[in-house]
């Protein structure tokens, strides 16, 4: 019950995250730079990983895609594949972990199958949840380290003066959904993979014996059932049986002079 | 290189009509708010009538209902219509705008100006 409860519950962490993944990246607001008021209108600039958006006090917005940008960072466009290889990840990962799932019967499969189906599942989560949490953190280590504009720029370019608007960038909420989903992502994947662990046919910790009646006159070693079972004092798997019982590996053996003790 | 370039100025009787066109050149990505300033001889420099990308539009309260201000957002280029002129119009008027080269990202804007075109109100 509890593997089933774990499992169920990795998958829900890691539906809910990878959900927020997908959303992350489609979001514009990965960097905002600070409001500034222009004579005309308040105007506020955001941008994501795909265009960038200006939202004006009149609650217009038009966003433009990047690709009339020329020469895009090769920094963004690894956080945008390290993106886009945790949702493919996730994706595959779910579709697995359905299959795997304890509570769907699907043909005979065994508890081998699914144990074997969590852990790859769990293991995508994870890897998933590490590419969204990469990807989010090489972009916010990005607008720290390149692209804060304490002071405004002014020069004479041709045609008149030049000077730069925005003071600085700062996170959007993207990278929190990011961050966020990221985590829970990953949070599901480790449950996936100790659900596994449950779900996996455990050894059995004693041998299992196999009788052969050698006759009428069969002589029991006192003990009952737990004696006959591999239980209780018999702990060394010593012979049960004065006549014809052996333990399966024994089979086909020879007596030895260990046979009887 | 980005530049802004003013033109349709000249001399005009008062009473009489300019119309005013700037023409944003160079790799532009996008253009937030386009305005038309001007500078007197001996005043400072001041905000005739401005429009944003989503059509808002300000304008001074000494230009109201003379001056009509329109930009054309597929062709990057603002216009002002100037009506009534009266001598107190005479200035050099400058383009400005608040655009982002295709060469920066993350976007950044920065505020152009154009060199000016004079405009004179004069019998």
């Known amino acids: 019950m509890a593997v089933t409860a774990c499992q169920g519950l990795g998958f829900v962490v890691s539906l809910i995250g990878i959900a927020g993944i997908i959303a992350a990246t489609c979001m514009d607001q990965w960097s905002t730079q600070d409001l500034y008021n222009n004579p005309v209108t308040a105007v506020f600039n955001y941008q994501g990983l795909w265009r960038s958006c200006v939202r004006e006090s009149s609650g217009f917005t038009e966003c433009r895609g990047y690709f009339t940008l020329l020469g895009l960072p090769a920094m963004l466009q690894a956080v945008r594949a390290l993106m886009i290889v945790g949702i493919v990840l996730g994706a595959i990962g779910l579709l697995v972990s359905i299959f795997a799932l304890k509570c769907i019967r699907i043909g005979s499969m065994e508890d081998s199958a699914k144990a074997n189906m969590t852990l790859t599942s769990g293991i995508m989560f994870i890897v998933s949840g590490l590419c969204a949490i990469a990807g989010v953190s090489v972009f916010a280590n990005m607008l720290v380290t390149n692209f804060w504009m304490s002071t405004a720029n002014m020069y004479t370019g041709m045609g008149g003066m030049v000077q730069t608007v925005q003071t600085r960038y700062t996170f959007g909420a993207a990278l929190f959904v990011g961050w966020v989903a990221g985590g829970l992502t990953l949070i599901g994947g480790v449950m996936m993979c100790i659900a596994c662990r449950g779900l996996a046919p455990e050894e059995t910790n004693y041998k299992a014996v196999s009788y052969h009646a050698s006759g009428h006159s069969v002589a029991y070693k006192p003990g009952g059932f737990k004696a006959s079972t591999g239980f209780g004092s018999n702990t060394k798997n010593k012979k049960i049986y004065d006549g014809g019982a052996r333990t399966e590996d024994e089979v086909q053996s020879y007596p030895s002079k260990h046979d009887y003790v | 290189e980005v530049q802004l370039v003013e033109s349709g100025g000249g001399l005009v009787q008062p009473g009489g009509s300019l119309r005013l066109s700037c023409a944003a050149s160079?790799?532009?990505?996008?253009?937030?708010?386009m305005g038309w300033y001007r500078q007197a001889p001996g005043k400072q420099r001041e905000l005739v009538a401005g429009i944003s990308t989503g059509g808002t539009t300000r304008y001074a309260d000494s230009v109201k209902g003379r001056f009509t201000i329109s930009r054309d957002n597929a062709k990057n280029t603002l216009y002002l219509q100037m009506n009534s002129l009266r001598a107190e119009d005479t200035a050099v008027y400058y383009c400005?705008?608040?655009?982002?080269?295709?060469?920066?990202?993350?976007?950044?804007?920065?505020?152009?100006w154009g060199q000016g075109t004079l405009v004179t109100v004069s019998s």
């Open positions: 160079g790799s532009i990505f996008s253009i937030n708010v």
């Open positions: 400005n705008a608040d655009l982002a080269t295709s060469y920066s990202w993350p976007v950044r804007y920065l505020e152009v």
